[in-house]
């Protein structure tokens, strides 16, 4: 807290300019009018105030706007945004995507801070859904943004927004998140032809059910092993050896290197050894010839 003292003669600020960087904190408090500061916020970012001086400027704005800053001020906060607490930000009503971009720019290159997370939350809640432009903006600044949302939050993403998602945006998503995103992606890309569709849907396949994988196996997609390894184990298990061979195409040889890892390991255990042998990869661990496989889960369902 800066002590209240009278402004020295001749030091009253008539505009926000570079001369103010030479003011001590108490001089800024005494000589800068809060209303002047609010109308000339766009200048603050270009002036190299120290963080301590920015504290004083924030204090002046807080006194002027105790209920929260108007968007005209928020849009021009610049470095002053770094001084805001999540509590401050919760008082704001940010509706413009330009404002959001301006503030994200200040934090660019850093991890998502609690302030940024609160800002995004306020913005998205204000819009009611995560529309394409917003998602585009957020994933441009924070590629992992989508995967930081809960499955419940992801359910508000309209399928049209999926076009904004890049493969790297899904890198840290877990299966529960992909379960929500996959049906949206399927809907978004449904009018594309086979090979183009596969390119777009590939990153989302960690949420695909068995029937969709079976359908893909009929389309000569040549799925790479990295994508195959991210598929849901429960979706892969019912696939036949022939279906997996068609799904992977020339990449089928990669199964040997992954035979000890899920989902390949679990899938091998469910296949007849005879069928596995047809691949000529030396995969071991299948069901020996002559053994009968009882699907107990099916039996339980019938009883």
């Amino acid at each position: 807290e800066v002590e209240k003292t009278a402004c020295p003669s001749g030091k009253k600020a008539r505009e926000i300019d570079e001369s103010l960087i030479f003011y001590k904190k108490w001089e800024l408090e005494a000589c800068v009018d809060a209303a002047l500061l609010a109308t000339q916020m766009d200048r603050v970012n270009a002036i190299p105030f120290t963080y301590e001086q920015l504290d004083v400027l924030k204090h002046k704005l807080d006194e002027l706007y105790p209920q929260g800053y108007p968007e005209s001020v928020i849009q021009h906060l610049g470095y002053l945004f770094l001084k805001m607490s999540p509590e401050d930000i919760r008082k704001w009503n940010v509706t413009s995507l330009e404002t959001l971009k301006a503030l994200l720019e200040v934090n660019k290159g850093h991890e998502m801070s609690p302030q940024v997370a609160t800002l995004i939350d306020r913005f998205v809640k204000g819009r009611g859904q995560l529309d394409k432009d917003t998602l585009d903006t957020l994933t441009a600044f924070y590629p992992g943004y989508l995967c930081s949302l809960s499955p419940e939050e992801l359910s508000s993403v309209p399928p049209s927004s999926i076009w904004a998602v890049r493969p790297q945006d899904l890198d840290t998503c877990d299966p529960r998140q992909l379960d929500v995103l996959y049906p949206k992606a399927r809907l978004a890309f449904q009018n594309m032809n086979g090979s183009e569709y596969f390119v777009k849907i590939q990153s989302f396949l960690g949420g695909a059910p068995t029937e969709d994988l079976k359908a893909l196996s009929q389309q000569n997609v040549s799925m790479d092993l990295a994508t195959f390894m991210k598929l849901r184990t429960d979706a892969v298990l019912p696939l036949t050896v022939a279906e997996v061979q068609k799904l992977l195409g020339p990449h089928v040889e990669g199964l040997k290197a992954e035979e000890r890892h899920r989902p390949v390991r679990d899938w091998i255990l469910r296949q007849r050894q005879d069928d596995l042998d047809t691949l000529g990869l030396g995969l071991q661990g299948g069901i020996p010839n002559g053994y009968l496989v009882l699907d107990l889960s099916m039996q339980e369902a019938l009883s």
Epitope: I21, P48, F49, T50, Y51, E52, Q53, L54, Y79
Partner: nanobody, 115 residues
Amino acid sequence: EVQLVESGGRSVQAGETLRLSCTASGFTFDDSDMGWYRQAPGDECELVSTISSDGSTNYADSVKGRFTISQDNAKNTVYLQMTSLKPEDTAIYSCRTMASRIGCWGQGTLVTVSS
């Protein structure tokens, strides 16, 4: 990693002259606006002088006409020439890139002016 090392501070009598140096490394010196800050015991940090990448300079009212800031890009060094020193100039002097927005922080170099 940005490094700034200040030197040249010592005890002098009022009216004497002193030159402080600040040698920089870890960033593009010629493109940076630099500043000298000072903090007197029990007082708050204040900016004394700045020099921009184009060579233009600015000074706090309290040192105008007495202090001169300059830089040598070849040596990655910024200087503060202080003349007609007064007891109220006693402080720890630090140099900073203006973009860092940090002000008084770190070691600095101590200037003591006695009357």
